[in-house]
Interface confidence: medium
């Protein structure tokens, strides 16, 4: 999505092997510089750019609409509750906000892919940062939900008790703060950069190669591997406890969170595998050639599209897997459509726990 400019080299046309052979004999490096710096060939990217031009604007436009509607619905349902939100609901509300903010940047990237970046350096920084903040926030909030469930079920501890909501609020604030920290490079290094060859302006990074690789590793670890490990660990233990206790109702209630985590893994794993290949090419562990570079660029576009689909997927999962969400949504629509018929609304069967559709005191999502 965001292009990168690095101060580590003037790139060579050859692949890594040739680069390392030739650079060591012909290039003059400073004391701490080695010829491992030079690993990227300047491949013509006509195919990947044409692919992006055709594929991304349509995809981003669709995801923008679906994401806005879906996450808007989730937020509306959660905020329409008269009682305090459970910890999981609070995390889900923040998740919906994160996903909404992420999809809000998609029209800008659609224009960038279709034509060029016409919004200036300021918005380039903001959109890039917003995009990454919410990418990280989505993953970390899902990890928080799983940790909350883990404490609640495995250790029978309600860390985020409904009484004082300070802990859950502090956790969410910590997540957003951490995401802001992760997005600092975007604020500093992103800018609208005119590309002479394309005769177009694009929102690009402008920082050293080591920074580019470090940022990719951070994205891979903090935005994917760590949250996924936390989720896997927590839900493995939760399922083990529930199976031992033969809590069928609880197991049914776990359905949605498991589906949400599986969706996260399925949506983001392909992209991060491609990023891993890119990192390995940056580090010289994989030879970089024009064919591979072009394939990686196209793969990155396709798999990132799949990843952004995750923003629209959660609301759909709640709608199709979460019975309680459907009930809340139906009630909200009734209330919006028929303001004078509130007394006629059908109360959900689990009205004794009417305050939440992802009950903290239960395994999770109690109405399933």
């Amino acid at each position: 999505m965001v292009l990168e400019v690095s101060d580590h080299q003037v790139l060579n046309d050859a692949e890594v092997a040739a680069l390392l052979e030739n650079f060591s004999s012909s290039y003059d490096y400073g004391e701490n510089e080695s010829d491992s710096c030079c690993t990227s060939p300047p491949c013509p990217q006509d195919f990947s750019l044409n692919f992006d031009r055709a594929f991304l604007p349509a995809l981003y436009s669709l995801l923008f609409l679906l994401g806005l509607l879906g996450n808007g619905a989730v937020a509306a349902v959660l905020l329409s509750r008269r009682t305090a939100l459970s910890s999981t609901d609070t995390f889900l509300l923040h998740l919906a906000v994160a996903d909404t903010l992420l999809v809000l940047t998609l029209p800008l990237w659609a224009v960038d892919a279709a034509v060029q970046w016409v919004f200036g350096s300021g918005l380039c920084k903001v959109a890039g940062a917003l995009f990454n903040i919410n990418f990280y926030a989505g993953a970390l909030l899902l990890a928080c939900i799983s940790f909350d469930r883990y404490l609640n079920i495995v250790h029978a501890t309600q860390l985020y008790r409904r009484g004082p909501p300070a802990r859950v609020t502090l956790t969410c604030l910590a997540v957003w703060g951490l995401c802001l920290l992760f997005a600092l490079p975007d604020f500093i290094f992103l800018s609208a950069h005119h590309d002479e060859r394309l005769n177009a302006t694009h929102c690009q990074y402008n920082f050293p190669q080591v920074g580019r690789t470090a940022l990719r590793v951070l994205q891979l670890v903090a935005g994917f591997l760590l949250p996924l490990l936390v989720m896997a660990y927590c839900y493995a233990h939760i399922l083990a406890v529930l199976l031992v206790s033969r809590g069928q109702r609880r197991l049914r209630a776990m359905r949605l969170v498991v589906v949400v985590v599986v969706a996260f893994a399925l949506c983001w794993t392909p992209y991060h595998l491609v990023v891993l290949v890119d990192i390995l090419m940056d580090l010289g562990a994989l030879a970089r050639n024009c064919g591979r570079e072009s394939r990686v660029d196209v793969a990155k576009s396709v798999t990132s599209g799949l990843g952004y689909m995750h923003c629209c997927l959660n609301p759909l999962l709640y709608a199709f897997v979460g019975v309680k969400f459907r009930e809340r949504m139906w009630m909200l629509l009734l209330r919006l459509g028929c303001p004078n018929q509130r007394g006629l609304q059908r109360q959900p069967s689990s009205s004794r726990r009417d305050s939440s559709w992802s009950e903290t005191s239960e395994a999770s999502y109690s109405g399933l």
């Epitope: 400019v5 003037v10 046309d13 300047p42 013509p44 005119h194 690009q204």
Partner: antibody, heavy 123, light 106 residues
């Protein structure tokens, strides 16, 4: 409009030194790698030196390595070529040239050239 | 070092002619770049990545080739095309140019 204006050329004796300058305008100088390319009278083009956009990395062919030093002052939008131990074969028109950036990568070719400054090494 | 040899070194042709300039590399290169230079002027980027025309270059110019042999072709020579053309490689340092092909009016 991209403009590169070389200066500092002139007549110098063998073994002498000279410092060429190239004033850049019309583009974000700090974002581009820059090079010097020379052309001996009536002869072809020869790459002399390259510097990365931040000035961290410098590149030279063996023919000038150790004698020529490329540098840049990004605050002044200026590229320099310090030439020491000059020889008769260094007599040439010296052009300052810009490397394009495409999808975040420097390219090896040159998309803009200055008009050049003539360096004559003769006793 | 990779040597680039252009042929012919001199070429006399008439307006409307189809002209081909060849650039041979002593060992395989990934891409070739072509520059046009007129007397007393700085070179101008003409073709990049073997076959892409630089902005403002007329469509009568084309580039092709791979490995060791690359060509620049002018389908119908125009008066403003008479100049010297140089090929360049950036596959292996030092980054060399061909000796040039001077295109003259017959």
């Amino acid at each position: 409009e991209v403009q590169l204006l070389e200066s500092g050329g002139g007549l110098v004796q063998p073994g002498g030194s000279l410092r060429l300058s190239c004033a850049a305008s019309g583009f974000t100088f700090t974002s581009y790698a820059m090079s010097w390319v020379r052309q001996a009278p009536g002869k072809g083009l020869e790459w002399v030196a390259t510097i990365s956009h931040g000035g961290t990395y410098t590149y030279y062919p063996d023919s000038v390595k150790g004698r020529f030093t490329i540098s840049r002052d990004n605050a002044k939008n200026t590229l320099y070529l310090q030439m020491n131990s000059l020889r008769a074969e260094d007599t040439a028109m010296y052009y300052c040239a810009r490397h394009p950036i495409y999808s975040g990568n420097y390219q090896g070719y040159f998309d803009y050239w200055g008009q050049g400054t003539l360096v004559t090494v003769s006793s | 070092d990779i040597q680039l040899t252009q042929s012919p070194s001199f070429l006399s042709a008439s307006v409307g002619d189809r002209v081909t300039i060849t650039c041979r590399a002593s060992s395989g290169v990934n891409y070739i770049y072509w520059y046009q230079q007129k007397p007393g002027k700085a070179p101008k980027l003409w073709i990049y990545f073997t076959s892409n025309l630089a902005p403002g270059v007329p469509s009568r110019f084309s580039g092709s080739g791979s490995g060791n042999e690359y060509t620049l072709t002018i389908s119908s020579l125009q008066p403003e095309d008479f100049a010297t053309y140089y090929c360049q490689q950036f596959t292996s340092s030092p980054y060399t140019f061909g000796q040039g092909t001077k295109l003259e009016i017959k």
